[in-house]
Structures are given as structure tokens and as C-alpha cells.
């Protein structure tokens, strides 16, 4: 969470941004809020990126002005125009690229004053893992797969029954480069699993952490997955 202040004569406005992460190839949002101003035509929003000449996006007089927009953002950005009057200056970003990572500035000017705040935008790839029983194996085993990760994550297994056990010697993890030559598919196989136990496959890099759980009993298989972004907020 970054809060910036600006001074315009005696007036300053608070601008707030949140560090966030973008998933390569998906659409993302760079969050920014400011003190609302009902005079829409008096609001100017400028998004800038450190090291880039030109603007990422500009919104003024109630509409976009992309005349100064840098080429790398062409056709990829939009503000939530109907939410600007209530203080939302967040930026939608289409088809997030690795090169979109960096420090952004959300600059606001209204009839009340002006202000700005920086935002650190991380980019990578992260996806939910899916665990299945691998019936092809000679012994009972579990296969954990996640289609898109970058940078290369670490993979670890855990079990409810054998808490604290190290499964590195009874598991095998591979990383397969996807067709776009950036992200990778993660596959990890855990061998010699026992029935009536809950196993967890944990995949983590510096952007996200994902966990897949599987409980195998005589009568059923229960699965659960979750993903959380790290250092956001």
C-alpha cells in the first residue's frame, strides 16, 4: 500500500496505490484511488512508467487522450471511466507482458489539488495446480500439474499424516517450456503414497504461491486448490 500526497497552493489530495502482480498473457489491473471530485471534466489521470518516454495512459476532460501514449501500450489500456468520479483511477492492462514489470506512477489532478503515488508492478505466470492419482505408475502415486509458471518455481510435497517429512527423495519434478517460450508447465510426481492421507503439492515463486490438496480414501478422492499472490496490498 502506497499513499502519496500532492500540494497545489494550499490544496493536496491523497492518492493510494497497491503493489500488484500481473499474469503473463492475461489481463491485469493496476490499482489507484484518489479523493473523489464530482467535477469529471476537471479530473486528469496520468499513468507513467519509469524508464518509458511518453505516457502509459491519460484520461482528461471526461475522456481518454492517447496522443502521448507509448507504443508498447497501444490498444492495451483503459480506465474505469464510469468510476473516475468516485475516485477510481485504476488502469486495466490487456495481455500482460514480462516487460510490463516496473515502477508506475499514478498522477491525479482535480479541482481540489493534485497528488501522485508509485506502484510496483510484478509480472510472471502462476496457475492453479491439479492433483490426480497416477494409475500408470508401478506403485500408487500422485501427479501434480500446473500449466503456467514463471519464473521457475519451487515445488514441495507435504502430508497430513507425516508432518514435517521430506518428500524430495520420493518425488520427481519437471519443468516443460510452453509454446510461447516464456512460461513453463510444472509436473511433479509423488511416489509410494498411502491411502487415507491428505497430500499437498505446493508451488511457489516470488510472485505467487499455489497449493493443491488431495485426500484419497477407499471410497473417494477429494481435491482442493488455492492460489495467493505474494507481497500484494
Amino acid at each position: 500500500l502506497i499513499i502519496g500526497f500532492g500540494i497545489s497552493g494550499k490544496h493536496f489530495i491523497t492518492v493510494t496505490t497497491f503493489t500488484s502482480a500481473g499474469n503473463i498473457g492475461e489481463d491485469g489491473t493496476l490499482s489507484c484511488t484518489f479523493e473523489p471530485d464530482i467535477k469529471l471534466n476537471g479530473i486528469v489521470i496520468q499513468w507513467l512508467k519509469e524508464g518509458i518516454k511518453g505516457l502509459v495512459h491519460e484520461f482528461k476532460e471526461g475522456k481518454d487522450d492517447l496522443s502521448q501514449q507509448h507504443e508498447m501500450f497501444r490498444g492495451r489500456t483503459a480506465v474505469f471511466a464510469d468510476q473516475v468520479v468516485v475516485g477510481n483511477a485504476s488502469l486495466r492492462l490487456k495481455n500482460v507482458q514480462l516487460t510490463d514489470a516496473g515502477t508506475y506512477t499514478c498522477y491525479i489532478r482535480t479541482s481540489k489539488g493534485k497528488g501522485n503515488a508509485n506502484l510496483e508492478y510484478k509480472t510472471g505466470a502462476f496457475s492453479m495446480p491439479e492433483i490426480n492419482v497416477d494409475y500408470n505408475a508401478s506403485s500408487e502415486s500422485l501427479r501434480c500439474e500446473a500449466p503456467r509458471w514463471f519464473p521457475q518455481p519451487t515445488v514441495a510435497w507435504a502430508s497430513q499424516v507425516d508432518q514435517g517429512a521430506n518428500f524430495s527423495e520420493v518425488s520427481n519434478t519437471s519443468f516443460e517450456l510452453n509454446s510461447e517460450n516464456v512460461t513453463m508447465k510444472v509436473v511433479s510426481v509423488l511416489y509410494n503414497v498411502t491411502i487415507n492421507n491428505t497430500y499437498s503439492c505446493m508451488i511457489e515463486n516470488d510472485i505467487a504461491k499455489a497449493t493443491g490438496d488431495i485426500k484419497v480414501t477407499d471410497s473417494e478422492v477429494k481435491r482442493r486448490s488455492q492460489l495467493q499472490l505474494l507481497n500484494s496490498g
Epitope: 498473457g25 492475461e26 489481463d27 475522456k63 481518454d64 487522450d65 492517447l66 496522443s67 501514449q69 507504443e71 497501444r74 490498444g75 492495451r76 489500456t77 483503459a78 471511466a81 486495466r92 490487456k94 495481455n95 509454446s179 510461447e180
Partner: antibody, heavy 120, light 107 residues
Amino acid sequence: QLQLQESGPGLVKPSETLSLTCTVSGGSIKSGSYYWGWIRQPPGKGLEWIGNIYYSGSTYYNPSLRSRVTISVDTSKNQFSLKLSSVTAADTAVYYCAREGSYPNQFDPWGQGTLVTVSS
Amino acid sequence: EIVMTQSPATLSVSPGERATLSCRASQSVSSNLAWYQQKPGQAPRLLIYGASTRATGIPARFSGSGSGTEFTLTISSLQSEDFAVYYCQQYHSFPFTFGGGTKVEIK
């Protein structure tokens, strides 16, 4: 409501330059949230995006046509234009102009289209 | 470039029936997809953008769904004016590309 109208010669000789103009009425070409694009459709075939322009003059072209395409804008006349050089019979198509959202980038509305035939 | 593939090429449907058109992208386009309707001798008309948002003035019988690489346009109850060619278009990355079209004809 916004309307677009293509104009230009319907017949162009091989190796010459195809020139079309799109006139925008019912709204300003300087509207900030839009690009202005060209799309073509050979007879009985599908649609191909040619490129777009912003009112400030910045352009983006389809790489398959980039070496032959020029799109320009005249804000005083509320018009934008397409030039396609060194044409061949394969460039025979109905050429459409359209307003293109800055993002989302859908095309709406479209001009009614003009058929350009490349033949000697 | 991203290749868009539509199926079937031709769909024969009786008036009042449901029509389901498919569009597949060669790689993920997230929800950055639009659908257009084109009648003979006319320009295409925008129906859907953002994969599922109906354009202004488009009847509720038209609906879009899907994300990533698989998309569907559904016409819940075909009217006589709906017989036309339908195109999908991705705007996820340049160059923007269209599918080859699906012709919906009267059965």
C-alpha cells in the same frame, strides 16, 4: 449517430497504388477513446485487419501488409485515408473503414464498404 | 499471429431453434474476443465484445461465452433476420485476426 463512408476509385491497375478515404459524420474523429481502422474482405472470403490510426497520427499496421500500407488522418476534414501500394489481383476486396475501441478493441460502427478491383 | 478457427463452416437450423457457433483461438486470448454478424451485401455488425457483453441494441437472444481459447455464440431462438454469416475476432494481440466465419442457413 456516428456514420462512416468510404470513397475512392473502384478500379486500380496492377502495380499502382490503391487510395481510399473514410469520412466520419455524426461525431468527431478526435474522440479520445477510439482508433480508426481499415479492414478488407476479398470476394466470398473472410475479414482481414489492415491497420489503424489515432487522431494524433500514430499508426499500427498488420505486419503482412506493413511494407505497402500507409494510413493517414485529416482532423480538419474528419477523415482518415488508406493507401496500399504495388497492388495485385490478390488485393481485390471490399474495403471497410470502422471505428475501433482503444480497449476493448471491437469494431463498431462500420462503413458500408467499397469494392476495389485490381485489374488491367 | 493468433489463428482463429470457427466451426462448423455451415449450420442448418430451423427458425425458432437454438444455434450454437464455436470459435477456437490458437493460443489464449483471455476474454478479448468479439462476434459480428454479416448479411449479404452489408458490412459486419458488432454483436458481442469482451466474449460475453452484448453491444448496444443487440437482442437478448444473442449470448456469448468462453475465455482463453474456446468461445461460443448462442442464438437462443433463431429469427428469420438472424440467417447470416457470423465471425469471431480476437483483439488480444496485434495483428487482430478474424475467424473464417460460420454461415447460419435455413434448414
